[in-house]
């Protein structure tokens, strides 16, 4: 039994990093394997993780890691039994991938406004929660090619676009991620799809 | 809810014996590194001694070394110290905390519970 | 041992006021200093951790600086139920080693 692709792990910052690895074949990754982690400081002692499959030769573990800071160093083992498969270590503040953010809502009713609000994934005592920045997408059902990214760089989980600026009498669909520069952290993933039917009063033209 | 209740406490005479108890709940107990802090009457925070998470290693300030024992039980999510040949300077309000995830710092407390030495 | 400092050892202040207290290590602790408020007859609670980290559930107008030897507790707003005696203590060495701690009472 090797690993065919080691260990990455990133970290949710909060409470959470995922580690995934490859097997060089099939592997039943709850029964077979174990990863210890053991954060590199004063009296601490390895924790184990009991991956799950992720694909035939995959694996994915969640370890638990609360009040991260910035020198968390933890050291990684993978285990086959006796047989130690993999070593090596992480920072979780170097590998972070924020929590995706939730609660999406578009509201219609704002005179010709669309107003897409937001929930923040992390409580006001984490770090991140003020560090976050969004990325809105929205994209017609209809039309592949109406596909559009707003870029939210204020720390309010909102934004407001005029409704005028997409088309009316189509539905739309909106999703938003967030990412924090100060962390150079990767994209979270993106939130659930929110749809909502866009309509407005097209202006009255005069000829 | 993480909680933490102290026990064990009173009167000793000097050379005595005690055993503090310490019961957790509202959080996964073999988890995290606990510790004593006490507190002299009027006085500030002493760190008396600390456990790993899996009862592993243990640490004691010097003032205390050789006299107390610090141990627990991760199936009864509990915490002890045990104190012997104390003295009156060992007079104190003994408070158990849990770590963050480092050993060294108290997240959480307990109401502490009173130890007097005196004869 | 690490020798911790605190100071002033105790100040008076109004609701409203910013209030700054100072902790100072013997030797650098590499920002492990954490922050304790303790009310009479109670037993403490943790502020902050790692210099500047808020604990779960503390409000805002708390914050933590420093780095090296040197660091600050910040109440940005002293509120009624801030009036208590605040401790520093130093996480980066055994053993672990508390200040003697700043009693803010009302002026």
């Known amino acids: 039994m090797k690993v065919l692709q080691e260990p990455t792990c990133v970290s949710d910052y909060m409470s959470i990093s995922t580690c995934e690895w490859k097997m060089n074949g099939p592997t039943n990754c709850s029964t077979e394997l174990r990863l210890l982690y053991q954060l590199v400081f004063l009296l601490s002692e390895a924790h184990t993780c009991i991956p799950e499959n992720n694909g035939g030769a995959g694996c994915v573990c969640h370890l638990l890691m609360d009040d991260v800071v910035s020198a968390d160093n933890y050291t990684l083992d993978l285990w086959a039994g006796q047989q130690l498969l993999w070593k090596g270590s992480f920072k979780p503040s170097e590998h972070v991938k924020p929590r995706a953010p939730g609660n999406l809502t578009v509201h219609t009713n704002v005179s010709d406004t669309l107003l897409l609000t937001w929930s923040n994934p992390y409580p006001p005592d984490n770090y991140l929660y003020n560090h976050l920045t969004y990325a809105v997408n929205i994209w017609s059902e209809n039309d592949p090619a109406d596909f559009r990214i707003y870029n939210v760089t204020y720390l309010e989980p909102s934004l407001r676009i005029a409704a005028s600026t997409l088309k009316s009498g189509i539905s739309y669909r909106a999703r938003v991620r967030a990412w924090a520069q100060c962390y150079n952290t990767t994209w979270s993933e993106w939130s659930p799809s929110t749809k909502w039917h866009n309509s407005y009063r097209e202006p009255f033209e005069q000829h | 809810e993480v909680q933490l209740l102290e026990s064990g406490g009173g009167l000793v005479q000097p050379g005595g014996s005690l055993r503090l108890s310490c019961a957790a709940s509202?959080?996964?107990?073999?988890?995290?590194?606990m510790s004593w802090v006490r507190q002299a009457p009027g006085k500030g925070l002493e760190w008396v001694s600390t456990i790993s998470s899996g009862g592993s290693y243990t640490n004691y300030a010097d003032s205390v070394k050789g006299r107390f024992t610090i141990s627990r039980d991760n199936v009864k999510n509990t915490l002890y110290l045990q104190m012997n040949s104390l003295r009156a300077e060992d007079t104190a309000v003994y408070y158990c905390?849990?770590?963050?995830?480092?050993?060294?710092?108290?997240?959480?407390w307990g109401q502490g519970t009173l130890v007097t030495v005196s004869s | 041992d690490i020798q911790m400092t605190q100071s002033p050892s105790s100040l008076s202040a109004s609701v409203g006021d910013r209030v700054t207290i100072t902790c100072q290590a013997s030797?650098?602790?590499?920002?492990?200093l954490n922050w304790y408020q303790q009310k009479p007859g109670k037993a403490p609670k943790l502020l902050i951790y790692y210099t500047s980290r808020l604990h779960s559930g503390v409000p805002s107008r708390f914050s933590g600086s420093g780095s090296g030897t040197d660091y600050t507790l910040t109440i940005s707003s002293l509120q009624p139920e801030d009036f208590a005696t605040y401790f520093c203590q130093q996480g980066n060495t055994l053993p672990l080693t508390f200040g003697g701690g700043t009693k803010v009472e009302i002026k």
């Open positions: 030797q650098d602790i590499s920002n492990y």
């Open positions: 509202g959080f996964t107990f073999s988890r995290y590194a």
């Open positions: 905390a849990r770590a963050t995830a480092r050993a060294t710092e108290f997240a959480y």
